[in-house]
């Protein structure tokens, strides 16, 4: 808290300008009118105030707007945003995407701070859903943003927003998140032709069910091993050797290098060794010839 002291003669600020950087903290407190500051917030970011001086400016705004800053002030906060706590931000009502962009720009190059997370949360909740423009903006600043959302939060993403998602935005998503995103992507890209569709849907396939993988195997997609390794194990297990061969195309040879890793390892254990041998890759661990495979899970479901 800065002490209340009278402004020295001749130092009263008539406008927010660079002469203020040479004011001591108590002089800023005493000589800068909060209402003047609020109306000239657009100048603050261009003035090289020290981090400590920004404390005083924040204090003045807090006194002027105890219930939270209006958006006209928020959009010009600039580096003052770094001084805001999540509690401060929860009082705001940010509706403009331009305001959001301006504040994210201040934090650019840094990891998502609690302040930024709170700001985004307030903004998205205010909009009611994560629309395409918002998602575009957020993933541009934070490629991992989508994967930081819970499956419940992702359920509010409309399929139309999926067009804004880039493959790198999904890098850190877990299967539960892809389970939610995949059906939306399938819906978003449904009118595209085979090869174009596969290019778009590829990064979402970690959420694809068996029947969709079977369908893809009929379309000469030549899925790469990196994508295959990210598929749900439970979706891969029912695939036949022939289906996997069609799905991977020339990339099928890569199975050998991955035979000890999931889902390839588990899939091999479910295949007849005879069938695996037809690939000519030397994959071992399949079911020996003459053995009968009982699907106990199916039996339990029936009883």
């Amino acid at each position: 808290e800065v002490e209340k002291t009278a402004c020295p003669s001749g130092k009263k600020a008539r406008e927010i300008d660079e002469s203020l950087i040479f004011y001591k903290k108590w002089e800023l407190e005493a000589c800068v009118d909060a209402a003047l500051l609020a109306t000239q917030m657009d100048r603050v970011n261009a003035i090289p105030f020290t981090y400590e001086q920004l404390d005083v400016l924040k204090h003045k705004l807090d006194e002027l707007y105890p219930q939270g800053y209006p958006e006209s002030v928020i959009q010009h906060l600039g580096y003052l945003f770094l001084k805001m706590s999540p509690e401060d931000i929860r009082k705001w009502n940010v509706t403009s995407l331009e305001t959001l962009k301006a504040l994210l720009e201040v934090n650019k190059g840094h990891e998502m701070s609690p302040q930024v997370a709170t700001l985004i949360d307030r903004f998205v909740k205010g909009r009611g859903q994560l629309d395409k423009d918002t998602l575009d903006t957020l993933t541009a600043f934070y490629p991992g943003y989508l994967c930081s959302l819970s499956p419940e939060e992702l359920s509010s993403v409309p399929p139309s927003s999926i067009w804004a998602v880039r493959p790198q935005d999904l890098d850190t998503c877990d299967p539960r998140q892809l389970d939610v995103l995949y059906p939306k992507a399938r819906l978003a890209f449904q009118n595209m032709n085979g090869s174009e569709y596969f290019v778009k849907i590829q990064s979402f396939l970690g959420g694809a069910p068996t029947e969709d993988l079977k369908a893809l195997s009929q379309q000469n997609v030549s899925m790469d091993l990196a994508t295959f390794m990210k598929l749900r194990t439970d979706a891969v297990l029912p695939l036949t050797v022939a289906e996997v061969q069609k799905l991977l195309g020339p990339h099928v040879e890569g199975l050998k290098a991955e035979e000890r890793h999931r889902p390839v390892r588990d899939w091999i254990l479910r295949q007849r060794q005879d069938d695996l041998d037809t690939l000519g890759l030397g994959l071992q661990g399949g079911i020996p010839n003459g053995y009968l495979v009982l699907d106990l899970s199916m039996q339990e479901a029936l009883s």
């Epitope: 261009a46 981090y51 400590e52 001086q53």
Partner: antibody
Framework: QVQLQQPGAELVKPGASVKLSCKAS????????MHWVKQRPGQGLEWIGM????????NYNEKFKSKATLTVDKSSSTAYMQLSSLTSEDSAVYYC????????????WGTGTTVTVSS | DIVMTQSQKFMSTTVGDRVSITCKAS??????VAWYQQKPGQSPKLLIY???NRYTGVPDRFTGSGSGTDFTLTISNMQSEDLADYFC?????????FGAGTKLELK
């Protein structure tokens, strides 16, 4: 990578002026303030002032107001500092430095120019 | 102007030592202090910012501490390549000011 390149040395006569240059590369020159710092042999560092390449706005340490003039040439991403009425007290190494806003510590320093004032 | 005082101009150390370099501000500067290392014929290099944050690529044997008026740069396990001048800087208010420096030498 981010670099601030300065000439190695300048020899000037007392009473004369000298214009030091600092060529920036590896970042958007117009997005960062440029500061200048003086270091006399065996002594500490002194902050001279700063200039914003985009606006041309300058702020000086009171001590250097009548000694230094800061300018920029945006087209060549170069900052300049002119030192006038030189005396032996001005013999020093002069650095340009890029700050981290709004914390004002310097993460990138120029290579430094040694100014020698001698007749 | 805020005066940054580094009372020890020179400090004698040996490899493996724990070395603490101090800096005192003439008034409260919060945590707005940075530390720089400078070797002969080279430009200063940022080590610590905001009193205690280690800059990218700086070995973890360098740590900064303090707030208000008293600040310390500690080298926990002195190495020969750490022989240099060390400067503190305050960025709490203008003009920005630096300490006069502390030179680390071998005993």
């Amino acid at each position: 990578q981010v670099q601030l390149q300065q000439p190695g040395a300048e020899l000037v006569k007392p009473g004369a002026s000298v214009k030091l240059s600092c060529k920036a590369s590896g970042y958007t020159f117009t997005s960062y303030w440029m500061h200048w710092v003086k270091q006399r042999p065996g002594q500490g560092l002194e902050w001279i002032g700063m200039i914003h390449p985009n606006s041309g706005s300058t702020n000086y340490n009171e001590k250097f107001k009548s000694k230094a003039t800061l300018t920029v040439d945006k087209s060549s991403s170069t900052a300049y500092m002119q030192l006038s009425s030189l005396t032996s007290e001005d013999s020093a190494v002069y650095y340009c430095a890029r700050p981290v806003v709004p914390y004002w510590y310097f993460d990138v320093w120029g290579t430094g120019t040694t100014v020698t004032v001698s007749s | 102007d805020i005066v940054m005082t580094q009372s020890q101009k020179f400090m004698s150390t040996t490899v493996g030592d724990r070395v603490s370099i101090t800096c005192k501000a003439s008034q409260n500067v919060g945590t707005a202090v940075a530390w720089y290392q400078q070797k002969p014929g080279q430009s200063p290099k940022l080590l610590i910012y905001s009193a205690s944050n280690r800059y990218t690529g700086v070995p973890d044997r360098f740590t900064g501490s303090g707030s208000g008026t008293d600040f310390t740069l500690t080298i926990s396990n002195m190495q020969s390549e750490d022989l240099a001048d060390y400067f503190c800087q305050q960025s709490s208010s203008y003009p920005l000011t630096f300490g006069a420096g502390t030179k680390l030498e071998l005993k």
